[in-house]
């Protein structure tokens, strides 16, 4: 396992469980998830005397990492004292230290609610010269709180003397005000009110709202996947609207057909994104025959915040057709990963670009999440190509050493599918008539990564190539004997001829 620094947690009792006449009390510090041994735990007990005991490290079964607990027992006026547990892990780095400062016990408390309010625009909807942000920290059990204002995550130098605290019944509230210039507010920075209380952090953030007519709203209309169209025979098209500003008004998506014929019932999904925008998806089932015969489907989008409606259309791709060529390869064993192998599938020279790629094992289709397939890219000619990559385990290939890469494409005959079988250990595989041993053309790869070199940003393949078992009748086209480089600006995807 690689070096891993520990996570450090304070261990305390609930105050109500400690007898009021207790003369000594024990608290602890947990260091967990580190590798390798050892950690060094020391305590700062202030003016009090204490005895410490560090328990032997235990191994965490799943990760192989370590955990240890250090206990501190103190006597005397411990109630008002803060204690610091200092954990050092020199294997991470000579100066790696994590400090945790805490009191002997934790009280039951009601945490605060943190909410930022902002001053209004003027009557004309414009921002005034200064904007006030008010941080309301409410409904917490009285106690010390610290308020910090952050601008894009950086602590701001703010006069906090204006913060005022009030108490209502058993709970307290505090408010802090931040005044910003219009320039700072309009600069699209995020302002955060961060509250530290009882060793916990609570916060709320705000920024200038998006304009009421969002610039970036985009709509996309997909074609049905060949798998849905030809195999499942239940094709759907999807209208995707992204980057909408969330608002009271809802997005209205209306489906229609250019022929004027009625459309099926669609399903709709709305998702709030991390950046605060809304994504709306509407999926419409279409008739297989209607689609193949060239019907045009339209998705019309309206929204209260869009000055105009927008429409997207989709129909079967026109132009020449070409069936895909499918080549499947197993990468050689790589030192240190004997129980895993990568299978690669090159599918090329197909037109149009719509294609579905599946992997099968034991005649069962593997979940899409198991494999990674590139988007179709243009070849030097007029067709398209994709790569698909599947990682398989020893357990799988020992159960049955035959994996099938299947391409579903409208130009493939007779049944819109072309497939190739590949074995991890070709010499040992029984396989079917369709099985193939490893080709005599193999994938070059860098010293760092087994399998396909990564596209953009990946390393250039190492000139020393690893060879699979020789094979004279591999069905690949002759041009694969020479180096093929696809797509400018990317690490070349290189194939070598006879090793």
């Amino acid at each position: 396992a690689s070096t891993q620094s520990p996570s450090v947690f304070p261990l305390t009792r609930c105050c109500k469980n400690i007898p009021s006449n207790a003369t000594s009390v024990t608290l602890g510090c947990l260091a967990t998830g580190y590798f390798p041994e050892p950690v060094m735990v020391t305590w700062d007990t202030g003016s009090l005397n204490g005895t410490t005991m560090t328990l032997p490290a235990t191994t965490l079964t799943l990760s192989g990492h370590y955990a240890t607990i250090s206990l501190l027992t103190v006597s005397g006026a411990w109630a008002k004292q803060m204690f610091t547990c200092r954990v050092a892990h020199t294997p991470s780095s000579t100066d790696w230290v994590d400090n945790k400062t805490f009191s002997v016990c934790s009280r039951d408390f009601t945490p605060p609610t943190v909410k930022i309010l902002q001053s209004s625009c003027d009557g004309g909807g414009h921002f005034p010269p200064t904007i006030q942000l008010l941080c309301l920290v409410s409904g917490y059990t009285p106690g010390t709180i610290n308020i910090t204002w952050l601008e894009d995550g950086q602590v701001m130098d703010v006069d906090l003397s204006t913060a005022s605290t009030t108490q209502e019944g058993e709970l307290a509230s505090t408010q802090s005000e931040l005044t910003l210039s219009q320039k700072h507010w309009l600069s699209d920075r995020t302002y955060t009110c961060q509250v530290t209380y009882q060793g916990h952090t609570f916060e709320d953030s705000t920024k200038k709202c998006a304009d009421s007519n969002p610039r970036g709203v985009s709509a996309y209309l997909s074609r049905p996947s060949p798998f849905d169209l030809f195999i499942r025979k239940s094709p759907t098209i999807t209208c995707l609207v992204v980057d909408l500003a969330p608002s009271k008004g809802t997005v209205n998506l209306t489906w229609s057909r250019a022929s004027g014929k009625p459309v099926n019932h669609s399903t709709r999904k709305e998702e709030k994104q991390r950046n605060g925008t809304l994504t709306v998806t509407s999926t419409l089932p279409v008739g297989t025959r209607d689609w193949i015969e060239g019907e045009t489907y339209q998705c019309r989008v309206t929204h209260p915040h869009l000055p105009r409606a927008l429409m997207r259309s989709t129909t079967k791709t026109s132009g020449p057709r070409a069936a895909p060529e499918v080549y499947a390869f197993a990468t050689p064993e790589w030192p240190g990963s004997r129980d895993k192998r990568t299978l690669a599938c090159l599918i090329q020279n197909f037109m149009p670009e719509d294609i579905s790629v599946q992997w099968l094992h034991n005649e069962v289709q593997l979940p899409d999440a198991r494999h990674s397939t590139t988007q179709p890219r243009k070849t030097k000619g007029s067709g398209f190509f994709v790569f698909s990559r599947l990682e398989v385990t020893r357990a799988e290939w020992e159960q049955k050493d035959e994996f099938i890469c299947r391409a579903v494409h409208e130009a493939a005959s007779p049944s819109q599918t072309v497939q190739r079988a590949v074995s991890v250990n070709p010499g040992l595989a029984g396989g079917s008539a369709q099985s193939q041993r490893a080709p005599d053309r193999v994938l070059c790869h860098s010293g760092q990564q087994q399998g396909l070199p990564r596209a953009a940003g990946g390393s250039v393949p190492h000139p020393r190539c690893h060879c699979g078992a020789g094979r004279a009748d591999w069905p690949g086209p002759p041009e694969l004997d020479v180096c093929v480089e696809e797509a400018e600006g990317e690490a070349p995807w290189t194939w070598t001829g006879l090793c």
Epitope: N213, T302, P307, R308
Partner: antibody, heavy 119, light 110 residues
Framework: QVQLVESGGGLVQPGGSLRLSCAAS????????MTWVRQAPGKGLEYVSI???????WYANWASGRFTISRDNSKNTVYLQIDSLRAEDTATYYC?????????????WGQGTLVTVSS | DIQMTQSPSSVSASVGDRVTITCQAS??????LAWYQQKPGQPPKLLIY???TLASGVPSRFSGSGSGTEYALKISRLQPEDFATYYC????????????FGGGTKVEIK
């Protein structure tokens, strides 16, 4: 067939107000975003305002404040109220229908109504 | 605001000539560039929408092209009825601005 007929133009003194009307027929008004465009004599086309099917409106920056667009789908009519008229507001005002699929331009225009601001 | 700059402001041509009018947007248009033809005393008429789609009833000698910020209207063989003023317009669904129309190009008889 689709028809847009503007009315309400005429000669008005500077500082005065006008309410232009656009009577729509031959289509369902509520399905379309509607726009007012003006053209000063011998000059190019100038966008004034748009109102979408939800009744929300947008204005060219220079028009904000003095111009008010509205629609009454039940009366098949779109309006443009112009206040504090100035000499530079002299123009032919066209009522126009945005294409149903939107973001594609204006597929039908009225013949326009001439507004002349002069003392 | 997106500004539309149309050029040339006028062009002299003869019947049968090929004429190209360009329109440059100050920033990329998400969708909906349209071209109009206007004759004196008449309202404009939609020729092309969505950058390149011919409006109903418009002759095929008119064509539109372009993407991003650069657009063009081409008249392959000028006919007598084509002498008019042409305007481009961005009809972006997500935006409005002061100058959605280009300044216009007058196509005159040489």
């Amino acid at each position: 067939q689709v028809q847009l007929v503007e009315s309400g133009g005429g000669l008005v003194q500077p500082g005065g107000s006008l309410r232009l009307s656009c009577a729509a027929s031959g289509f369902t008004l509520s399905n379309h975003d509607m726009t007012w465009v003006r053209q000063a004599p011998g000059k190019g086309l100038e966008y004034v305002s748009i109102i979408n099917t939800y009744g929300n409106h947008w204005y060219a920056n220079w028009a904000s404040g003095r111009f008010t667009i509205s629609r009454d789908n039940s009366k098949n009519t779109v309006y443009l109220q112009i206040d504090s008229l100035r000499a530079e507001d002299t123009a032919t005002y066209y009522c126009a229908r945005e294409t149903h699929h939107g973001s594609s331009g204006i597929d039908h225009w009225g013949q326009g109504t001439l507004v002349t601001v002069s003392s | 605001d997106i500004q539309m700059t149309q050029s040339p402001s006028s062009v002299s041509a003869s019947v049968g000539d090929r004429v190209t009018i360009t329109c440059q947007a100050s920033e990329s248009i998400y969708s909906g560039l349209a071209w109009y033809q206007q004759k004196p005393g008449q309202p404009p008429k939609l020729l092309i929408y969505d950058h390149s789609t011919l409006a109903s009833g418009v002759p095929s000698r008119f064509s539109g092209s372009g993407s991003g910020t650069e657009y063009a209207l081409k008249i392959s063989r000028l006919q007598p009825e084509d002498f008019a003023t042409y305007y481009c317009q961005h009809a972006d669904y997500a935006h409005h601005s002061d100058n959605v129309f280009g300044g216009g190009t007058k196509v005159e008889i040489k």
